[in-house]
Amino acid sequence: MMTGTIETTGNISAEKGGSIILQCHLSSTTAQVTQVNWEQQDQLLAICNADLGWHISPSFKDRVAPGPGLGLTLQSLTVNDTGEYFCIYHTYPDGTYTGRIFLEVLESSVAEHGARFQIP
């Protein structure tokens, strides 16, 4: 039985041109994490594998940095980065856990004067 839960940063906003950290945390399970995937809609951003370390998709290499921890840092944000992001934890023996984060990238002035989403 899958007993784990994923805690995420939820709905967040960031300024165009800035950076944001996406983070998920798997808890309440003794399952061993073997791999974490980060995806944007259906696009793979990055993988962190227990045996192979990090792999950043070539198309995101210039704008994505791993960490902190199992998180992912998105840099030089554009309005096109707005959307859903998923952390997918592959574990043994539980299987797969998925967390969702919605990122809204705002024009600088909008972000400064009251973003719609705040980091909890």
């Epitope: 805690e7 791999q35 227990a50 370390g53 990090w54 940095a65 921890g69």
Partner: antibody
Framework: QVQLQQPGSELVRPGASVKLSCKAS????????MHWVKQRHGQGLEWIGN????????NYDEKFKNKGTLTVDTSSSTAYIHLSSLTSEDSAVYYC??????????WGQGTTLTVSS | DIVLTQSPATLSVTPGDSVSLSCRAS??????LHWFQQKSHESPRLLIK???QSISGIPSRFSGSGSGTDFTLSINSLETEDFGMYFC?????????FGGGTKLEIK
């Protein structure tokens, strides 16, 4: 097998600079963060900073921002820490250690840096 | 920066005893807490990752628990090889930080 090789010791004069090395083998160097940790004699562990060889991205503890500079040479799978304006306070063991899915599963043996005239 | 406070600073015990070492974070670090052992003149060694997850080659007498801000490393039936320094470390946010350490010494 994974290995992080560091020179055993370095002796330098106060005011000088030094570049400590950490040669990695047994894994894909560009896929793991490399961290540097300082330990003064008989004291605790201090995180200096880290570098991701795949992109050169670095992070530093504020305390070490004007003291250490982290670089890598991916062609030789070697990480470096350049320490400047050395004083006796910089005398310590400096460890390199890597991070992938979790920190810090492999450590170098440490380089003992002695700053003395 | 996240401050990790370990207690006690020193623990004097007898082989065969069981002990608990504490690590408290200044703010929530979720489950991003790891434990290391360091013997004199050696590099640190990872004992437990992500609060309680085991590491290959580490004896089962080492176990971890806790969440959020309060964490514990437990060692059941201490062996002579277990004496040394123990550090906790957080990977929740940069800068990563270590606790000040607990020295486990033979009584």
């Amino acid at each position: 097998q994974v290995q992080l090789q560091q020179p055993g010791s370095e002796l330098v004069r106060p005011g000088a600079s030094v570049k400590l090395s950490c040669k990695a083998s047994g894994y894909t160097f560009t896929s793991y963060w490399m961290h540097w940790v300082k330990q003064r004699h008989g004291q605790g562990l201090e995180w200096i900073g880290n570098i991701y060889p795949g992109s050169g991205t670095t992070n530093y503890d504020e305390k070490f921002k004007n003291k250490g500079t982290l670089t890598v040479d991916t062609s030789s799978s070697t990480a470096y820490i350049h320490l400047s304006s050395l004083t006796s306070e910089d005398s310590a063991v400096y460890y390199c250690t890597r991070e992938g899915l979790y920190p810090f599963d492999y450590w170098g043996q440490g380089t003992t840096l002695t700053v003395s005239s | 920066d996240i401050v990790l406070t370990q207690s006690p600073a020193t623990l004097s015990v007898t082989p065969g005893d069981s002990v608990s070492l504490s690590c408290r974070a200044s703010q929530s670090i979720r489950n991003n807490l790891h434990w290391f052992q360091q013997k004199s003149h050696e590099s640190p060694r990872l004992l437990i990752k992500y609060v309680f997850q085991s590491i290959s080659g580490i004896p089962s007498r080492f176990s971890g628990s806790g969440s959020g801000t309060d964490f514990t490393l437990s060692i059941n039936s201490l062996e002579t090889e277990d004496f040394g320094m123990y550090f906790c470390q957080q990977s929740n946010s940069w800068p990563y930080t270590f606790g000040g350490g607990t020295k486990l010494e033979i009584k």
